[in-house]
C-alpha cells in the first residue's frame, strides 16, 4: 500500500517520496531525535525512516459505526444503522516522555489511540468515557493541540486540545485542557484537568449561539506553546459580519486564542482577532502558522532578543470561503512580544473598567468590564471576573510576500547561521524558499529565491516539517510525503550563479570550484577560501590579454583578487589544451603561453582568433577556480590590406609580398609596411 | 548615497541632558538597526546600545541603563540618542552607526558630534 | 563583558611592507548560528571609524585587497599585505557576538 521512494516532480534530481494511494494523508512528525517520521491518514498511522522508507502501518479502520450513535457502538448498542466508516486522523502528536505517539481520528466520536513509537503497536484506545470522545468531525485539519509534559519526576502531563463540534455543543467542548495519564488504560485519561461544579478546564459552545447561528463553529489552524501560554490560530465564523440568515452569505474571522498553561479554570482565555493587510487588501484567512526563532540578522532588525519567539503566518485574501480560500494569499510576521503586548493592553484596560469584555459568540449578554486595582503584568493569568476577554482591534502583522497567483498553504521556518529561512507550500504542489530580510535589495522584507515541486498539482498541507538536522523539508499532500532538500546549492556552476542564487545556504568554495554550504567547504573558515558575497567571487586579469599563433612561450602575468594563499601552487590551464607552471611573486602569477607547436591545435580552422579560457588550476585540489578570457590571434589569415591592418589585433600588411603578418621584421625593410590604412 | 548625518558640538553644564541626533540617508531606514558609540578624548570606542529602527526596541550597555534613552523618528528618519545627569567623563565625540545585514558590524557610520561636559 | 585584546598598541611600519596586528577575546566569539561576530574597523586622524573586515575575513566592499582578516574562536589577525600612506591610523577589533558589544583597546599604524 505504500509505493516505493520515486522522483520528484520538475527538473530537480529526485527528491525521496512515499505514497500512499488508497488512503489519504492528513499529518505529519518528526521525531527530534531519531528523525524517524510518523504519517496520519484515513484508515492507517505510517512510520517511516528519515529517508522515507516504510518501517510500520498500524490500521485505524474502517470502522463500524455512525456519526450519530452516541456514545459509540462499542460502548452501547446504538438504535442507528451501522456502516463502514473511515476514520480519519485529525491530531498526531508525540509524546516523548511517555515514548508514545497520540494518533486522534474522527470515528467513534474522536476517540484516540496510543501507540508505542517503536512499532506503533496500540498501547490503549480510550473510549468508555464521555472525556474521551474529542469530536466526530471527519475534517482533517480542523483540530489542534498542545502536548505539555508534566514537571520531571511529578506533576502530570497533560494535553489542551481544540477542535470544532459540528453543532454538538452538549457532547463536545470546542476547547479544553485534558490528561494524559502514564498508563494509557487508566480511567482518567482524558479527564479535565479541573472540574466542579461551576467552573472546569473547558470551553463549550453555547446553545444560544448555535441557535442564532447554526453554522457557527471554531477551526482550530495551528496551535503553540510560547513561555507560560497556548496560542490557537483558529477561524471562525464571525458572527458581526454574518447574518443569522442560513441561506446569507458566511464571513470568517481569524483568531489568535491564548490560555497559560498552569490555569486550570480558563481564566485567562483571550481572544483577538488577527490577520495583516498590504497595500489595502486585507488578509484574514488563516493558512497555517509555524513558530520560530528570528535568526542573528532579522532580530536585529526588529529589536529583539534571539531567543525571542516569532510566529510566520499565512493568511488568504479576505474573509470569506473558508474550504476554499481565494489564491491570493500572504506570508506575514508577528512577534510574540507585540502579540503579548496588545494581550497586556487589553487586560489592563478592562481592569480600568474601561469598554466591555466583547465575545459576542460565548457571552450571550454584552458584559462591562469591572474596575479592579489589580497589577496586570506580563504573566498574569486572570481572575474569576473580566473573563473570557476578546480583543477588538485586529492584531496586524507584517506583511513580508504576497501570492497572486498560487495560493500559500503552508510554512515552516528556522535559522540559518544567522539567516531567516521560511519553506510556503502552495496550492500546485510547489515549496517556495524565502529569506526573510528587512535589508532585502529594494527594500523587500522577504525575497522568494527558489521555487521546487514537491507534487505536481497537489496541494500542501499543513505539516511542514523540517528533519532534525534541518538537511531536509517533509512536505506532504494528500497522496504523498515528499523530502525536498533546504538547498540545492550543487545545482550553481559559477559563483556568479551561485551568490547571485541568494540562497543564504550557499557560498562559492573557491579552491574546490563549486557552490556549497560553509560545513561543506575544506577550510572555508580560512581567508578568502569561501565567498559568501557576490562581491568575493574570484576577479582575473592578464597582460598581454592575446599572442599571435606564431609567438611561442610568451611571459603572462595574471593578476587576481578574491584569492586565498596560493602558496601550495597554481598551473595556468589552457582549457584543456595545455597547462603550464606559474611563478608567484609580489602577489602576482607568472606563467607562459603555450609553445608554437601547441598553439596550432588550438587556432587550427578558427579564422582570424580564438577565445580561449585561461584558467587557473590548484595544485591543493587539481580544481580550475578562476579564468579569464585569453586571445589567440592569426594575422596570417587576412588577405587584403584593409582586413588585416583594420581588425583588432597589432598586424601588419606586407606591401609587396601581400602578408598579414604581427611581426615587423617578417617585411622586407625595402618593401614597407602598413599597420593603419593608407587611403 | 547611504549616510549618516549627526546634529553640531554642545556644551554642557554637569548634572545636564544631551541629545544628539542622527539623519541617515539613501537607504530604507526602519531596515537596519542604529547603534551609538562613543570616543572620549584621546581613548578608544565603547558601544552605547542600539535600537531597531523598525519597531524602537532597544538594548542598552549596562553602565549607561537609567541614563541613556534612544529613540527614532521615522517619518524624518532620525535617530536620537538623550543622556541624562551628565558628568564631565561623558565627555566624548558621540558617534552613530549603521548595523550591518547581520546587525553584527557597523557599515555606516555618521561624522560625529563632539559633547563637552563642564562647569 | 568580553575583554578584546589587542598587540601591539602601536606598529611603525615601512611603506609597502607587511603589518599585522592581532586581536584576543576573554571567551570564544563563535556564536550559537555557527557565525563569528568580530569585525575590524580603521579610524584615520580626525575621522569616524570605518568597517574594513567583518566576520573574521569577509572584506567590506570598497576595501581594498591588501587587508586580509583570518582567526577562530579567541585569536584573530588582521594582516595587510603592503602598507600605503593612506593605511596611517589606530585599528580597532570589535566583538558583537555576546552583549554588550566590546571594542580593542586599539592599534596605531604609522609609518617608520
Known amino acids: 500500500e505504500a509505493g516505493l521512494p520515486r522522483a520528484g516532480g520538475g527538473s530537480q534530481p529526485p527528491f525521496r517520496t512515499f505514497s500512499a494511494s488508497d488512503w489519504g494523508l492528513t499529518h505529519l512528525v518528526v521525531h527530534e531525535q531519531t528523525g524517524e517520521v510518523y504519517v496520519g491518514a484515513v484508515n492507517r498511522i505510517y512510520k517511516l525512516s528519515g529517508n522515507l522508507t516504510l518501517l510500520r502501518a498500524h490500521v485505524t479502520g474502517p470502522v463500524e459505526d455512525n456519526e450519530k450513535c452516541y456514545p459509540p457502538p462499542s460502548v452501547q448498542s446504538c438504535p442507528h444503522g451501522l456502516g463502514s466508516t473511515d476514520n480519519v486522523n485529525k491530531l498526531l502528536l508525540l509524546d516523548y516522555a511517555a515514548n508514545r505517539l497520540l494518533a486522534c481520528g474522527s470515528a467513534s466520536q474522536g476517540i484516540c489511540q496510543f501507540l508505542r513509537l517503536d512499532d506503533l503497536f496500540k498501547l490503549g484506545e480510550p473510549h468508555h468515557r464521555k472525556e474521551h470522545y474529542l469530536s466526530s468531525v471527519q475534517e482533517a485539519g480542523s483540530m489542534a493541540g498542545v502536548l505539555i509534559a508534566g514537571p520531571p519526576g511529578q506533576g502530570q502531563a497533560k494535553l489542551f486540545v481544540g477542535t470544532p463540534i459540528d453543532g454538538k455543543s452538549e457532547y463536545f467542548p470546542t476547547l479544553s485542557s485534558r490528561r494524559l495519564m502514564a498508563n494509557e488504560e487508566d480511567a482518567d485519561m482524558f479527564g479535565f484537568v479541573y472540574q466542579d461544579e461551576f467552573v472546569s478546564s473547558q470551553l463549550k459552545i453555547p446553545s444560544d449561539t448555535l441557535s442564532k447561528f447554526p453554522a457557527f463553529d471554531i477551526y482550530y489552524v495551528y496551535s503553540f506553546r510560547s513561555e507560560q501560554f497556548v496560542y490557537y490560530l483558529t477561524l471562525q465564523l464571525d458572527t458581526q459580519l454574518t447574518s443569522p440568515d442560513a441561506a446569507g452569505e458566511h464571513f470568517f474571522t481569524s483568531k489568535i486564542v491564548r490560555l497559560c498553561v498552569d490555569d486550570p479554570k480558563f481564566y485567562s482565555y483571550v481572544e483577538f482577532p488577527i490577520g495583516c493587510e498590504q497595500a489595502g487588501v486585507e488578509y484574514r484567512l488563516v493558512q497555517d502558522a509555524y513558530l520560530s526563532r528570528p535568526g542573528r540578522a532579522l532580530a536585529h532588525q526588529l529589536g529583539l532578543a534571539e531567543d525571542e519567539d516569532v510566529l510566520f503566518t499565512v493568511f488568504a485574501q479576505g474573509q470569506k470561503n473558508r474550504v476554499k480560500p481565494p489564491k491570493e494569499s500572504a506570508l506575514c510576521l508577528f512577534t510574540l512580544r507585540a502579540i503579548k503586548e496588545k494581550i497586556k493592553e487589553r487586560i489592563q484596560s478592562c481592569y480600568r473598567g474601561e469598554g466591555k469584555l466583547s465575545l459576542p459568540w460565548l457571552l450571550n449578554k454584552e458584559l462591562g468590564c469591572i474596575n479592579s486595582p489589580l497589577q496586570i503584568d506580563d504573566d498574569f493569568c486572570g481572575q474569576d471576573f473580566n473573563q473570557p476577554l476578546g480583543g477588538t482591534v485586529t492584531i496586524e502583522g507584517t506583511p513580508l510576500f504576497v501570492d497572486k497567483d498560487d495560493g500559500l498553504t503552508a510554512v515552516a521556518a528556522y535559522d540559518y547561521r544567522g539567516r531567516t529561512v521560511v519553506f510556503a507550500g502552495t496550492r500546485s504542489g510547489r515549496i517556495r524558499k524565502i529569506l526573510v530580510d528587512l535589508s532585502n535589495p529594494g527594500g523587500r522584507p522577504a525575497l522568494a529565491y527558489e521555487s521546487v515541486v514537491a507534487q505536481e498539482g497537489s496541494p500542501i498541507l499543513r505539516d511542514l516539517v523540517l528533519s532534525p538536522n534541518h538537511q531536509y523539508l517533509y512536505a506532504m499532500t494528500e497522496k504523498q510525503v515528499t523530502r525536498v532538500p533546504v538547498e540545492s546549492c550543487v545545482q550553481y556552476t559559477s559563483c556568479e550563479l551561485c551568490l547571485g542564487s541568494r540562497d543564504p545556504h550557499c557560498g562559492w568554495c573557491v579552491l574546490h570550484s563549486i557552490c556549497s554550504r560553509r560545513d561543506a567547504c575544506e577550510r572555508a573558515d580560512e581567508p578568502q577560501r569561501f565567498a559568501a558575497d557576490l562581491l568575493q567571487c574570484v576577479q582575473l586579469t592578464v597582460q598581454p590579454r592575446n599572442v599571435s599563433v606564431t609567438m611561442s612561450q610568451v611571459p603572462l602575468v595574471l593578476q587576481a583578487w578574491n584569492v586565498p594563499d596560493l602558496s601550495a601552487g597554481v598551473n595556468c590551464s589552457f582549457e584543456d589544451f595545455t597547462e603550464s607552471e606559474s611563478v608567484l611573486e609580489d602577489g602576482r602569477i607568472h606563467c607562459r603561453s603555450p609553445s608554437a607547436r601547441e598553439v596550432a591545435p588550438i587556432t587550427r580552422g578558427q579564422g582570424d582568433q580564438r577565445v580561449v579560457k585561461l584558467y587557473l588550476k590548484s595544485k591543493e585540489t587539481g580544481k580550475k577556480f578562476a579564468s579569464v578570457d585569453f586571445v589567440f590571434y592569426n594575422c596570417s589569415v587576412h588577405q587584403s590590406c584593409l582586413s588585416c591592418v583594420n581588425g583588432s589585433f597589432p598586424c601588419h600588411w606586407c606591401k609587396y609580398r601581400h602578408v598579414c603578418t604581427h611581426n615587423v621584421a617578417d617585411c622586407a625593410f625595402l618593401e614597407g609596411r602598413v599597420n593603419v590604412s593608407e587611403d | 548615497e547611504v549616510q549618516l548625518v549627526q546634529s553640531g558640538a554642545e556644551v554642557k553644564k554637569p548634572g545636564a541632558s544631551v541629545k544628539v541626533s542622527c539623519k541617515a540617508s539613501?537607504?530604507?531606514?526602519?531596515?537596519?538597526?542604529i547603534s551609538w558609540v562613543r570616543q572620549a578624548p584621546g581613548q578608544g570606542l565603547e558601544w552605547m546600545g542600539w535600537?531597531?529602527?523598525?519597531?524602537?526596541?532597544?538594548n542598552y550597555a549596562q553602565k549607561l541603563q537609567g541614563r541613556v534613552t534612544m529613540t527614532t523618528d521615522t517619518s524624518t528618519s532620525t535617530a536620537y540618542m538623550e543622556l541624562r545627569s551628565l558628568r564631565s567623563d561623558d565627555t566624548a565625540v558621540y558617534y552613530c552607526?549603521?548595523?550591518?545585514?547581520?546587525?553584527?558590524?557597523?557599515?555606516?557610520w555618521g561624522q560625529g558630534t563632539m559633547v563637552t561636559v563642564s562647569s | 563583558d568580553i575583554v578584546m585584546t589587542q598587540t601591539p598598541l602601536s606598529s611603525p611600519v615601512t611603506l609597502g611592507q607587511p603589518a599585522s596586528i592581532s586581536c584576543r577575546s576573554s571567551?570564544?566569539?563563535?556564536?550559537?548560528?555557527?557565525?563569528?561576530?568580530l569585525s575590524w574597523l580603521q579610524q584615520r586622524p580626525g575621522q569616524p571609524p570605518r568597517l574594513l573586515i567583518y566576520?573574521?575575513?569577509n572584506r567590506f566592499s570598497g576595501v581594498p585587497d591588501r587587508f586580509r582578516g583570518s582567526g577562530a574562536g579567541t585569536d584573530f589577525t588582521l594582516k595587510i599585505s603592503r602598507v600605503e600612506a593612506e593605511d596611517v591610523g589606530v585599528y580597532y577589533c570589535?566583538?558583537?557576538?555576546?552583549?554588550?558589544?566590546?571594542f580593542g583597546q586599539g592599534t596605531s599604524l604609522e609609518i617608520k
Open positions: 539613501g537607504y530604507t531606514f526602519t531596515s537596519y538597526g
Open positions: 571567551q570564544s566569539l563563535v556564536h550559537s548560528d555557527g557565525n563569528t561576530y
Open positions: 552607526a549603521r548595523g550591518g545585514r547581520g546587525g553584527d558590524a557597523f557599515d555606516i
Open positions: 570589535m566583538q558583537a557576538t555576546h552583549f554588550p558589544w566590546t
Open positions: 566576520q573574521i575575513s
Open positions: 535600537i531597531s529602527a523598525y519597531n524602537g526596541n532597544t
